[in-house]
């Protein structure tokens, strides 16, 4: 097995992930592993020399960079919060704070905004990934209601009066629950006509 540095006439290396072509010497050299950087470039007689990234810096991939990337914080003012710290091999992992979605993306989320409220009679469609997009409000399905303006409230099933030994006084809608009454209670005058069938 050939180990770097080795000559390459066609400008390609056997292991593209862990080696790179150095055009000045027309050789293939080792890349540095994640968490390290190039402290001395390769030559015909000596392979790449790597060194560990200093504190508060990282390199995520096999590389031939002469510096490490600076760790960046998750800025709360931009709606972000940290979920995992920066290491020598991985940048700080950020997400949107609760009740927010990513509103600006440049390789990673840079700015979050508050999720829109869903009006009464609707709920936010459940997403595969939290924080990925703004709310898409969908109507409550039959037999369910939601009576607030909220980014997170879920549609609830209408109360079944009979389960509580009561009778229905007014049917539920998408925005309101069923109204129940005692079977012995007299009906209000305006409703008595509709109930005497």
């Amino acid at each position: 097995q050939v180990v770097p540095p080795y000559g390459s006439e066609n400008q390609t290396c056997r292991d593209q992930e862990k080696e790179y072509y150095e055009p000045r010497h027309r050789i293939c050299c080792s890349r540095c592993p994640p968490g390290t950087y190039v402290s001395a470039k390769c030559s015909r007689s000596r392979d790449t020399v790597c060194a560990t990234c200093a504190e508060n810096s990282y390199n995520e991939h096999w590389n031939y960079l002469t510096i490490c990337q600076l760790c960046r914080p998750c800025d709360p003012v931009m709606g972000l919060e940290e979920i995992a710290p920066c290491t020598s091999k991985r940048k700080t992992q950020c997400r949107c704070q609760p009740g927010m979605f990513c509103a600006a993306w440049a390789l990673e989320c840079t700015h979050c905004e508050l999720l829109s409220d869903c009006p009464p009679g609707t709920e936010a469609e459940l997403k595969d990934e939290v924080g990925k997009g703004n709310n898409h409000c969908v109507p409550c399905k039959a037999g369910h209601f939601q009576n607030t303006s909220s980014p997170s409230a879920r549609c609830q099933p209408h109360t079944r009066c009979e389960d509580q030994g009561l009778v229905e006084a007014a049917p539920g809608t998408a925005q309101s629950d069923t109204t129940c009454r005692n079977p012995s209670e007299s009906l209000p005058p305006e409703m008595s006509g509709t109930m005497l069938m």
Epitope: C74, P76, V77, E81, I83, Q97, P98, G99
Partner: nanobody, 112 residues
Framework: DVQLVESGGGLVQPGGSLRLSCKAS????????FGWYRQAPGKQRELVAT???????WYDVSVKGRFTISRDNAKNTVYLQMNSLRPEDTAVYYC??????WGQGTLVTVSS
């Protein structure tokens, strides 16, 4: 918008300690991450410490090991415990969060 009131600054000798407080109103406190920022004379405002909703903390390398950020959700308050203070820590300190109004800040002066 979120209102923030910082307090606890003052004049302290090098090596001394201070505890800054930040009282927040106008938001669901437990749903917000917070940061402490500072601005030294003639310099840009910089982020020095953050705390997430879950209590995860981040510190700038210049304060790591000396400063501690914490939160008390019951009191709607974020704290910054500052130990082993140095003259270069002299600045106006602010706390802030999403849609927070920048307050007056609290001045920390480290001098002998």
């Amino acid at each position: 918008d979120v209102q923030l009131v910082e307090s606890g600054g003052g004049l302290v000798q090098p090596g001394g300690s201070l505890r800054l407080s930040c009282k927040a109103s106008g938001t669901t406190f437990s749903d917000r991450a917070f940061g402490w920022y500072r601005q030294a004379p003639g310099k840009q405002r910089e982020l020095v410490a953050t705390i997430s909703t879950a209590g995860l903390t981040w510190y700038d390398v210049s304060v790591k090991g000396r400063f501690t950020i914490s939160r008390d959700n019951a009191k709607n308050t974020v704290y910054l415990q500052m130990n082993s203070l140095r003259p270069e820590d002299t600045a106006v300190y602010y706390c802030n969060t999403f849609r927070g109004n920048w307050g007056q800040g609290t001045l920390v002066t480290v001098s002998s």
